[in-house]
């Protein structure tokens, strides 16, 4: 699917903004009048909703934050414009719960369905004499099965909410003014502090800092990172080493250990938190590879770990090689996904930033057009991706990376060998059958690995419904550190890929992400998308979410534009 559209935006079948005529098959169009076709606001034909449909039944649901409908009948709504509805009623004698499909354009029990586009059925109280009456409507599969009476963002009185906003808005004006003043003062203090830090790094002004072109100076670092951007992408050639105090060990890899550390400033109390990657003497080659990659000023990007400097250090244990970078407290993506379930919005941010980071790495120019050496990572995996405070990704660990220098010969490329982590290796890497004539082949292996990481993110997203414990790709099929041979069995012999359960596809955005990652892990490297294309697709997703004006964090779709018609 989508092979002819690999380098574009969403394939046509994913873009919702098509005309009706182009969406209905010609052989069906002939006999269908347009008034029988139901479309969404953008002209996409709608699939019908799947809803619980038990009409009115007695219920035991009372004084609870949420209840299950206990309705065993799921119906395909007769008309595709219909949404799921639940009505809870309590009078002196009994409690009833009604579950139905209904057209939101028509009142139900004399009330308009205001929340029909919501993915959840959040009950709102309605005024009915002689009884307590709650109603909700929603637009995701069987969403009226779980009826919610209490949600943080729910209010039973929208008018009251408006009054609260108005009152708090007016009363907050004076403190808001004070707050803005404080921020400005703090900003000035920070700028002054950053300049002091820069001078610490300069040691006698013997070193000129590399600069961005003035037309393109963009601050790309994490907005909560303490590192001065002026310090980035430098090799510390001075004999005087930075005043760094190692704190705790935060990670251990094949070649090095990573420490959280304090970079001291002029006064002993002040420090910046940094990360220090320490390579033992024997791993000089890995340190040099990563140092050389990081030394390229054009590599600087918000989704690539911010590099500060590299140092050679003599200790009582012998010579060590240090890389000093920004520190990200949330840790790596694998740890983060193990500990946290993520929302749809988080998934979009994490996925988008990952794709942008890889696209920048692969690109032969910077965002502002300066020539740049394309780089392939060759060991992309969730433990080599850091999560920043704003819940975006940045790539790290370039120890196996390769600069795609146009002067490299096929022999040079061949000598780079089968590198990476077996679990994340593309089929052609496992098979050692890469097309070395084409440097794009290296990028295509990164894209395959990226697809597996996107799958990991999706597997922990609560917008799909039930979320299982974190499991790495192929987690149920291979042991913890699989060898190349066992991955060959899975990926080459069985053409296996991580499972995409069908219920993930109930969410429109996640369906798009799944379509994308499926194209990224295609067996045929040529058929895979580019990282840039994936980044553009994520931008498109954000655009679609904004256009439809929904809170995208958990939006589910009835599953797709669907077609049902009046009978």
């Amino acid at each position: 699917m989508g092979r002819g559209l690999l380098r574009g935006l969403w394939p046509l079948h994913i873009v919702l903004w098509t005309r009706i005529a182009s969406t209905i098959p010609p052989h069906v169009q002939k006999s269908v009048n347009n008034d029988m076709i139901v479309t969404d606001n953008n002209g996409a034909v709608k699939f019908p909703q799947l809803c619980k449909f038990c009409d009115v039944r007695f219920s035991t649901c009372d004084n609870q934050k949420s209840c299950m409908s206990n309705c065993s009948i799921t119906s395909i709504c007769e008309k595709p414009q219909e949404v799921c509805v639940a009505v809870w009623r309590k009078n002196d004698e009994n409690i009833t719960l009604e579950t139905v499909c209904h057209d939101p354009k028509l009142p139900y029990h004399d009330f308009i369905l205001e929340d029909a586009a919501s993915p959840k059925c959040i009950m709102k109280e309605k005024k009915k004499p002689g009884e307590t009456f709650f109603m909700c409507s929603c637009s995701s599969d069987e969403c009226n099965d779980n009826i919610i009476f209490s949600e943080e963002y729910n209010t039973s009185n929208p008018d009251l909410l408006l009054v609260i906003f108005q009152v708090t808005g007016i009363s907050l004006l004076p403190p808001l003014g004070v707050a803005i003043s404080v921020i400005i003062i703090f900003y000035c203090y920070r700028v002054n502090r950053q300049q002091k830090l820069s001078s610490t790094w300069e040691t006698g002004k013997t070193r000129k800092l590399m600069e961005f072109s003035e037309h393109c100076a963009i601050i790309l670092e994490d907005d909560r990172s303490d590192i001065s951007s002026t310090c980035a992408n430098n090799i510390n050639h001075n004999t005087e080493l930075l005043p760094i105090e190692l704190d705790t060990l935060v990670g251990k890899g094949r070649f090095a250990e990573v420490y959280k550390a304090k970079l001291k400033q002029n006064t002993s109390e002040q420090f910046e938190t940094v990360a220090v990657k320490i390579f033992p003497y024997e791993e000089y080659a890995s340190w040099k590879t990563e140092k050389d990659i990081f030394s390229d000023i054009n590599l600087k990007h918000e989704n690539i770990l911010q590099f500060l400097t590299a140092e050679e250090r003599k200790t009582e244990l012998g010579k060590q090689y240090w890389l000093i970078t920004a520190f990200h407290a949330k840790g790596n993506l694998q740890e983060y996904l193990t500990r946290h379930v993520i929302s749809w919005e988080d998934l979009r941010k994490l996925g988008s930033s990952l794709a942008r980071g890889i696209a920048h790495l692969h690109s032969d120019h910077t965002p502002c057009g300066r020539p740049k050496m394309p780089i392939v990572h060759r060991d992309l995996k969730s433990s080599n991706i850091l999560v920043k405070n704003d819940l975006t990704c940045c790539l790290c660990d370039f120890g196996l990376s390769l600069r795609l220098d146009p002067t490299l010969s096929v022999d040079d490329l061949a000598n780079s060998g089968q590198v990476g982590t077996a679990r994340y290796m593309a089929p052609e890497v496992l098979e050692s059958r890469m097309n070395l004539e084409n440097v794009e082949s290296f990028k295509q292996t990164d894209v395959y690995s990226m697809a597996l990481v996107l799958w990991e993110m999706t597997s922990r997203c609560n917008a799909v419904g039930e979320v299982k414990d974190y499991e790495p790709p192929f987690g149920s099929k291979v042991r913890e550190h699989p060898c190349v041979e066992s991955m060959k069995d899975n990926v080459l012999r069985d053409r296996g890929r991580p499972e995409i359960p069908s219920f993930w596809l109930n969410h429109q955005g996640i369906q798009m992400v799944c379509e994308t990652l499926t194209e990224c892990w295609d067996h045929d490297p040529e058929a895979r998308l580019t990282a840039q294309c994936v980044a553009e697709r994520f931008s498109e997703l954000e655009h679609l979410d904004r256009l439809s004006g929904r809170s995208c964090s958990e939006e589910k779709i009835p599953e797709d534009g669907s077609l049902n018609t009046t009978k």
């Epitope: 699917m1 079948h13 034909v45 797709d560």
Partner: nanobody
């Protein structure tokens, strides 16, 4: 390229049975909900039945509940519709459809005629 090919239609007497098949190719079949949709002569489209990607969940329109059974064989990339106790009003062209974000993945349809 996504392809869906329906077969199994034909002329049957009221009360009779038919089994429709839909052979799918060009996409990862197991990842998608699939639908059977029908269109009676001069009428609109009616969604008959749906089945989840793994086949564990099935859904039916009220008009066919208890008479039709949807199933799938993911190893063969094939969708089925077993139709029993057929009625004259079941006469229609039956299409299988891949659940997706637009409406371009349909087969050519197979005609089912229920008549005595």
């Amino acid at each position: 390229e996504v392809q869906l090919l329906e077969s199994g239609g034909g002329l049957v007497q009221p009360g009779g049975s038919l089994r429709l098949s839909c052979a799918a190719s060009g996409f990862t079949f197991v990842n998608y909900r699939m639908w059977w949709v029908r269109q009676a002569p001069g009428k609109g489209l009616e969604w008959v039945s749906a089945i989840s990607g793994s086949g564990d969940k099935t859904y039916y329109a009220d008009s066919v509940k208890g008479r039709f059974t949807i199933s799938r064989d993911n190893s063969k990339n094939t969708l089925y519709l077993q139709m029993n106790s057929l009625r004259a009003e079941d006469t229609a062209v039956y299409y299988c459809a891949k659940h997706g974000l637009s409406f371009d993945y349909w087969g050519q349809g197979t005609l089912v005629t229920v008549s005595s």
